[in-house]
């Protein structure tokens, strides 16, 4: 068992051109805080994957207001260390993610707002008990300077925090076969309580008589280096001669993952996928509870009343992510139907509807003809969010209110003359033509093409079109 400690020294603009704008202003004062996430091994995992070694949030830093016209300086930092306790052996190799968050303190609707300023990540080798390691990481135009170390919690000592130390029973020297505990020279290594023969370098135990292996080692006494190349068995390496396991109990048998974690075998041992809110090699640690206020942007923390239960954040509309830290463009979900224009006002979503549609999401197709009378005997025809009138003869326009000139379209063919009439129009046909529109030629022999002229009308007489 032990503690990983992170000390942030500075966060500010990096060297070179393109200095970032200050994240705070007179209108929007803000303060910083940091989050660290640790994972065992040199994993290339996504930022969202579980922090299996643990995670920690810093306190909020001092409030900072930008001085107008001044370049962004190093920003004021929270006091103290970020500490991530680990209960099992320190793995020696680890991956880290350090996030710099901004808390805006202006007149925010619904309280403070949070946004991620920078995220840096790296993979490192580190022995527990060693000195502070210094590091500089850049994220865009920002630069983060920090130091870190892993230290064992008494009585554990060693590079993996797996050896146990006890105060000396005699003032002068340690008991037979026991060495002083460097750097605690006034303490002695505790008598071995692990299984007899358990490798002192590659094995450790938390209970008397057990022998658990550090990463990279296997076998009942942790004396066999892991080698995946020559193994046929899916269980992985074990035998001291071949370096391979004979089929036997798998590392996930009995599910070593606590708190509902799911176990999956890896070439070296096993890996626990923990429920949200739980960390640690066996999902035994909960680094964050609802009391830590992990839900941003108005999110509600559900569950997670104590370190042994996971929390989840229920996010207000417009935010997502495990901590409601990601803003969603709600209009990208195309909530407005029937071609409506989407407006995300922050406090609400609005749709501006096309003509003929209504409702909060333009979901209602209006009855286009409702309340719309067509004048002068016209009939209303619906269509596509608009109405039109089919007008009676002699009328036109959108609502059939305009008296139409029936002769405007030159309806009389072959040079016939058009006369407006109360019931429509009349064509006076030119010689040689007949019909309502003068559309039929009269044959030279006096017989007309169908239809024949009604009795009493000579070809050439005006014919009324009814």
């Amino acid at each position: 068992a032990g503690v990983f400690e992170l000390q942030i020294h500075s966060f500010g603009p990096g060297p070179g051109p393109g200095a970032p704008r200050s994240p705070c202003s007179a209108r929007l004062p803000c303060r910083l805080f940091f989050r660290v996430c640790l994972k065992p091994g040199l994993s290339e995992e996504a930022a969202e994957s579980p922090c299996a070694l643990g995670a920690a949030l810093s306190a909020r830093g001092p409030v900072y207001t930008e001085q107008p016209g001044a370049p962004a300086p190093d920003l004021p930092l929270p006091d103290g260390l970020l500490q991530v306790p680990f209960r099992d052996a320190w793995p020696g190799t680890f991956s880290f993610i350090i996030e710099t968050w901004r808390e805006e303190l202006g007149d925010q609707i619904g309280g403070p707002a949070w946004s991620l300023l920078a995220r840096v990540a790296g993979r490192r080798r580190l022995a527990a008990g060693g000195p502070w390691a210094r590091d500089i990481q850049r994220a865009g135009a920002w630069e983060l300077r920090f130091s870190y170390r892993a230290r064992c919690e008494p009585p554990a000592v060693g590079t993996a925090c797996t050896r146990l130390c006890r105060p000396r029973s005699a003032p002068s020297r340690c008991g037979p076969g026991l060495r002083p505990c460097a750097p605690l020279e006034d303490e002695c290594e505790a008598p071995l309580v692990c299984r007899a023969g358990c490798s002192p370098e590659h094995g450790f135990c938390e209970q008397p008589g057990e022998c658990r292996c550090l990463e990279g080692w296997t076998g009942p006494l942790c004396t066999v280096p892991v080698s995946t190349s020559s193994c046929l068995s899916p269980r992985g390496p074990s035998s001291a001669t071949t370096g391979c396991l004979v089929p036997g109990p798998g590392p996930c048998d009995g599910n070593p993952c606590a708190n509902g974690g799911s176990c999956s075998e890896t070439p070296r041992s096993f890996e626990c996928t923990c429920p949200r809110g739980f960390y640690g090699l066996r999902c035994e640690v909960s680094g964050v509870t609802c009391a830590d206020g992990p839900c941003f942007n108005g999110g509600l923390c559900v569950g997670g009343a104590d370190p042994d239960s996971a929390y989840i954040c229920h996010c207000p509309p417009g935010f997502q992510g495990s901590n409601c830290e990601k803003r969603v463009d709600r209009c990208s979900l195309q909530p407005c139907r029937n071609g409506g224009l989407c407006l995300d006002l922050g406090h609400a979503l609005r749709c501006r509807c096309r003509a003929g549609f209504a409702g909060p999401r333009c979901e209602h197709d209006l009855d286009d003809c409702a309340g719309r009378a067509c004048a002068n005997g016209g009939t209303c025809v619906e269509g596509g969010g608009a109405h039109r009138c089919s007008c009676a003869l002699g009328f036109g326009g959108r609502d059939c209110r305009e008296r139409a000139d029936p002769c405007a379209a030159r309806p009389c063919a072959h040079g016939g003359r058009c006369y407006a009439h109360f019931s429509g129009l009349v064509c006076a046909c030119a010689p040689g033509y007949m019909g309502a529109r003068c559309e039929f030629p009269v044959h030279p022999d006096g017989a007309s093409a169908l239809p024949a002229a009604p009795p009493g009308l000579r070809p050439g007489d005006p014919q009324r079109y009814l």
Partner: antibody, heavy 118, light 108 residues
Framework: QVQLQESGPGLVKPSETLSLTCTVS????????WTWIRQPPGKGLEWIGY???????NYNPSLKSRVTISVDTSKSQFSLKLSSVTAADTAVYYC????????????WGQGTLVTVSS | EIVLTQSPGTLSLSPGERATLSCRAS???????LAWYQQKPGQAPRLLIY???TRATGIPDRFSGSGSGTDFTLTISRLEPEDFAVYYC?????????FGGGTKVEIK
């Protein structure tokens, strides 16, 4: 602006199930979380639970074993069912919308009194 | 759950006076996720303040909220006749959502 209207029987017999419906107008039911709150006569407010249009729910642990909240987006309604009622469940029941900026209550129905009595 | 305790239970004041209502949480309310409501007899509650200090739309500026952590205050700078009502605080940082027991502001 959101308007909410509770409806349902005003009298329920002990051990039966209380059923109420809230009809939402003025905005889309998919815009907000929707909640039920109750107030026994002469007493304070008690949150019952909420629902999102996606089906996400969260209930007060003190009532969780008896409460079901559901949503019907096509009708712009959400409903409350409270089983095995006793006289202690007599209260004015309010439906309300949960604000976009956090889980507080910005628009309320006028409330409906439900009496549990045989 | 977070228990909210309001004090005093009843506040007797005259119109024009200043009213100070207290809401104390059993544990820290994260990010000042605290709201205040006003309720008049026979009516539904009305949102006054959220985020501990932000006035809701249409709320007069004589109402103000302050506080963080576990101690929150609602102040009515000059009581108007229509302000005599019951006031509730509510936290919305941690589930379950909880209300205070209420403070009744009555005419002296």
């Amino acid at each position: 602006q959101v308007q909410l209207q509770e409806s349902g029987p005003g009298l329920v017999k002990p051990s039966e199930t209380l059923s109420l419906t809230c009809t939402v107008s003025g905005d889309s039911i998919s815009s907000y979380y929707w909640t039920w709150i109750r107030q026994p006569p002469g007493k304070g407010l008690e949150w019952i639970g909420y629902i999102y249009y996606s089906g996400t729910t969260n209930y007060n642990p003190s009532l969780k074993s008896r409460v079901t909240i559901s949503v019907d987006t096509s009708k712009s309604q959400f409903s409350l069912k409270l089983s095995s009622v006793t006289a202690a469940d007599t209260a004015v029941y309010y439906c309300a919308s949960i604000a976009v900026r956090g889980f507080f209550f910005d628009y309320w129905g006028q409330g409906t009194l439900v009496t549990v009595s045989s | 759950e977070i228990v909210l305790t309001q004090s005093p239970g009843t506040l007797s004041l005259s119109p024009g006076e200043r009213a100070t209502l207290s809401c104390r949480a059993s544990q820290s309310v994260s990010s000042s996720y605290l709201a205040w409501y006003q309720q008049k007899p026979g009516q539904a509650p009305r949102l006054l303040i959220y985020g501990a200090s932000t006035r809701a739309t249409g709320i007069p500026d004589r109402f103000s909220g302050s506080g963080s952590g576990t101690d929150f205050t609602l102040t009515i700078s000059r009581l108007e006749p229509e302000d005599f009502a019951v006031y509730y605080c509510q936290q919305y940082g941690t589930s379950p959502l909880t209300f205070g027991g209420g403070t009744k502001v009555e005419i002296k």
